[in-house]
């Protein structure tokens, strides 16, 4: 006989990344029939939604209506149908941003290179942080996390017309706690004009998207959880 | 934001009855989710019990379930903690507190950490002892 219900999907919208003081939205979908759905924040209830009526819902939202460094953290569901519980969901990883000060993303030796040049980008912050994240803009989860007293340096090796994309770069002070955004670094890769066109850049979602952080570390903000993304989310861990 | 003051508190003996009342202004009251905090002499803050905006959700911390009945009165803009079977453990400061931002709540959501609150009242004292 079944113990538990099979572990209901948790995300974040628009993003896990968060902008303080601006509204995040945790997502938990279940299945329909739960007359319970429980948000947990670091092992502790956070809040229920008892749905209504629960045979026509399968999913509830959880409002942050204001974000700040006391509500990033660690959130889990779980949800009961019945008396039967289910697992809890993967654990979300809510992040605010904007925090402090702004770090300066620098590459070497350009913005511009060759196909095949050793390229390292550099990630500088003069407050107390020792942790880097650098993000490449695209639906692809290129994310590296790099350490340095004031400034971490990103070796990508050999470059490829694969690396090409803009780059932007965060001091993070803990886990769940991230600088504002660097300016953004667009690396041009130019190799042969086969290569180029083999090698078309990531679909990336527009420029102006940044401001909420639609960019990196799901596939595409789909809503089909299968296909999730966990780069970003396992590096918290 | 919305202004929330508290009344009700006073000196009770063991097993007695209290009932607190907070009257809400500013925000739309009928549409938030609500709560009460306590906070005991010395001790930290802690979660009471929760309120939807519809009246449809209520949930208690396990120290006060089965004694302790939260409800609303959204005509007159008022959240109620009633309190019966008090104990000296219950000596506390007590806060209404309500949810922030404008945004369209779920009818049976409940929100059961004091860090989900944004707008607190002054908070109002209960005391009991014999």
């Known amino acids: 006989q079944q113990q538990t219900l099979p572990k209901p999907f948790i995300w974040a919208e628009p993003h896990f990344m968060v902008p303080k003081e601006k509204q995040v939205t945790i997502c938990c979908q279940g299945n329909y029939g739960a007359v319970e759905y429980q948000l947990h924040f670091e092992g502790s209830l956070f809040a229920v939604d008892r749905p209504k009526p629960p045979e026509r819902i399968n999913k509830v939202q959880f409002y942050i209506p204001d974000m700040n460094s006391r509500m990033a953290g660690q959130y889990s569901c779980i949800y009961r149908v019945g008396e039967l519980w289910s697992e809890p969901s993967n654990l979300l990883d809510l992040v605010v941003t904007e925090m402090y000060d702004t770090p300066t993303l620098s590459v070497h030796p350009g913005p511009e290179v060759i196909s095949g040049e050793k390229v390292t980008f550099y990630c500088r912050l003069d407050t107390a942080t020792s942790m880097f994240l650098l993000l490449k803009e695209g639906r692809s989860s290129h994310v590296q996390r790099g350490y340095g007293k004031v400034q971490a340096e990103f070796p990508l090796g050999p470059v490829t017309t694969a690396h090409r994309g803009t780059y932007r770069c965060f001091g993070s002070y803990n886990n769940h706690a991230w600088s504002f955004p660097s300016e953004p670094v667009k690396l041009l890769v130019t190799g042969d004009i086969e290569n180029t066109s083999l090698a078309p850049e990531d679909p990336t979602f527009p420029a102006d998207t940044w401001g909420t952080y639609l960019l990196t570390t799901e596939t595409g903000l789909q809503k089909d959880h299968a296909l999730w993304d966990h780069t970003a989310q396992n590096l918290l861990r | 934001e919305v202004q929330l003051v508290e009344s009700g508190g006073g000196l009770v003996q063991p097993g007695g009855s209290l009932r607190l009342s907070c009257a809400a202004s500013g925000r739309t009251f009928s549409r938030l989710p609500m709560g009460w905090v306590r906070q005991a002499p010395g001790k930290g803050l802690e979660w009471v019990s929760a309120?939807?905006?519809?009246?449809?959700?209520?949930y208690y911390a396990d120290s006060v379930k089965g004694r302790f009945t939260i409800s609303r009165d959204n005509s007159k803009n008022t959240l109620y903690l009633q309190m019966n079977s008090l104990r000296a453990e219950d000596t506390a400061v007590y806060y209404c507190a309500a949810v922030g931002g404008s945004l369209d709540y779920s009818a049976t959501v409940v929100y059961t950490a004091a860090r989900a609150y944004a707008d607190w009242g002054q908070g109002t004292l209960v005391t009991v002892s014999s």
């Open positions: 309120i939807s905006w519809s009246s449809s959700t209520t």
